[in-house]
């Protein structure tokens, strides 16, 4: 009669939870049986993010830290089942935790928009295009962002208009701008559940131009033209 290792009821155990579950929530469980009828002690291996704990008696798996889908889903760990007593033989199975997205990332600018400029003085109202993004999952359709100016005082000088779900146009309302940098605050709403807003800043410089680029004294790099 040869002592055999515990046998898991499945090769892979899979569970699905919302990424915003409270710490201490049961997120899944695993089961194994020992051919000799011995008790099983369960443990986790490879919990690199430190998100989980397993009850070594019941095989229930609990969250011990905030989960984050954007860090990667599914989250894969190994579960070890060890005989209690006997020869302490063990077996390994996989536990895959699929994290369902919660709208928990505010919109932001899709790239670095430093270096935006208009040649001063403006001969006509100008505009530039910018793009927004966020790190949440957008199933079946892309993001549907809405855009507005971040403060009422900006409305005399600027207007923002939506191009599509991710892009918008920032336009000047007149041509009477000083030769300096203006920081334009843009409010971006993702329309999610719950809706999240991000307020981003677009630095726009009005500068004297030489051959279509901002003139800077020696030692300063030329800005790129964005309008």
């Amino acid at each position: 009669d040869v002592n055999e290792a515990p046998q898991f009821s499945q090769h892979v155990f899979q569970a699905k939870v919302s990424e915003d579950v409270a710490i201490g929530t049961k997120v899944g469980n695993v089961t194994a049986k020992d051919p000799e009828g011995l008790d099983i002690s369960y443990s986790l291996r490879g919990d690199t993010r430190g998100w989980l704990k397993i009850d070594h008696v019941t095989g229930e798996i609990f969250s011990v830290a905030p989960l984050d889908r954007e860090a990667g889903s599914p989250y894969r760990v190994q579960v070890v089942a060890t005989e209690v007593g006997g020869s302490s033989l063990s077996s390994v199975s996989e536990f895959h935790l699929i994290l369902m997205d919660v709208n928990d990332n505010p919109p932001r600018l899709a790239k670095d928009y430093t270096g935006l400029f208009f040649c001063h003085p403006l001969s006509a109202p100008g505009s530039l295009i910018f793009e927004a993004t966020d790190d949440d999952q957008h199933l079946f359709r892309g993001p549907h962002f809405t855009f507005s100016l971040g403060s009422g005082s900006l409305q005399n000088d600027w207007e923002v208009s939506k191009i599509n779900g991710t892009h918008a146009r920032l336009s000047t309302r007149h041509t009477e701008f000083e030769e300096r940098e203006y920081v334009v605050l843009i409010r971006i709403n993702d329309g999610g559940r719950p809706p999240l807003e991000g307020i981003v800043s677009l630095p726009v410089t009005f500068c004297s131009c030489v051959e279509g680029s901002c003139f800077r004294p020696a030692g300063h790099k030329h800005h790129h033209h964005h309008h």
Partner: antibody, heavy 117, light 108 residues
Framework: EVQLQQSGAELVRPGASVKMSCKAS????????IHWVKQTPGQGLEWIGA????????SYNQKFTDRAILTVDTSSNTAYMQISSLTSEDSAVYFC??????????WGAGTSVTVSS | DIKMTQSPAIVSASPGEKVTMTCRAT???????LQWYQQKPGSSPTLWIY???NLASGVPSRFSGSGSGTSYSLTISSVEAEDAATYYC?????????FGSGTKLEIK
């Protein structure tokens, strides 16, 4: 005969720690999980946690997870529980128990802990 | 956590009477992991019934256990004086293991 022999009664000050023992005889400690249970007249029986002496795997009731530490010394066939930051609410009888298939088939006689200044 | 509620808190019976005590769980419990313990004053609990209906070694056959899901019971077909004790149910289907608050059996 399978027995679990627990250490004697303790009188401790609030804020202090207590460490009690549970010595197994008649079987090898590493053959079963050891559980600890608190009993008070008001709260009845409360499971504190369990340890598998074979490899140190342990599980705790979240209520006790910050203050209770379960350990074993397999060379002396003894399990230990330490509780820290004691308050009057920790005054109780603490039992160790052996489990098989998740039922507690052998219990120690209990260690009485009184927390008082 | 699964809360176990026992009723009645106290039951008083004459020798020879049939007694039933119940244990209800706030969520479903596997019958494999539902136990009953007997405790007499000044003593530690003793395993009495395990896996819902199996009598522990040395427990008289007048005791029986039954139930499933969220409702379990312990029955004594013909109470004897030595049965005077407090009986606790326990679930270990889900962690943390939890106990009922006990039913005290008094003999008239």
């Amino acid at each position: 005969e399978v027995q679990l022999q627990q250490s004697g009664a303790e009188l401790v000050r609030p804020g202090a720690s207590v460490k009690m023992s549970c010595k197994a005889s008649g079987y090898t400690l590493t053959s079963n999980n050891i559980h600890w249970v608190k009993q008070t007249p008001g709260q009845g029986l409360e499971w504190i946690g369990a340890i598998y002496p074979g490899n140190g795997d342990n599980s705790y009731n979240q209520k006790f997870t910050d203050r209770a530490i379960l350990t074993v010394d397999t060379s002396s066939n003894t399990a230990y529980m330490q509780i820290s930051s004691l308050t009057s609410e920790d005054s109780a009888v603490y039992f160790c128990a052996r489990s098989f298939r998740r039922y507690f088939d052998v219990w120690g006689a209990g260690t009485s802990v009184t927390v008082s200044s | 956590d699964i809360k176990m509620t026992q009723s009645p808190a106290i039951v008083s019976a004459s020798p020879g009477e049939k007694v039933t005590m119940t244990c209800r769980a706030t969520s479903s419990v596997s019958s494999s992991y539902l136990q009953w313990y007997q405790q007499k004053p000044g003593s530690s609990p003793t395993l009495w019934i395990y896996s819902t209906s199996n009598l522990a070694s040395g427990v008289p056959s007048r005791f029986s256990g039954s139930g499933s899901g969220t409702s379990y019971s312990l029955t004594i077909s013909s109470v004897e004086a030595e049965d005077a004790a407090t009986y606790y149910c326990q679930q270990y289907s889900s962690s943390p293991s939890t106990f009922g608050s006990g039913t005290k059996l008094e003999i008239k």
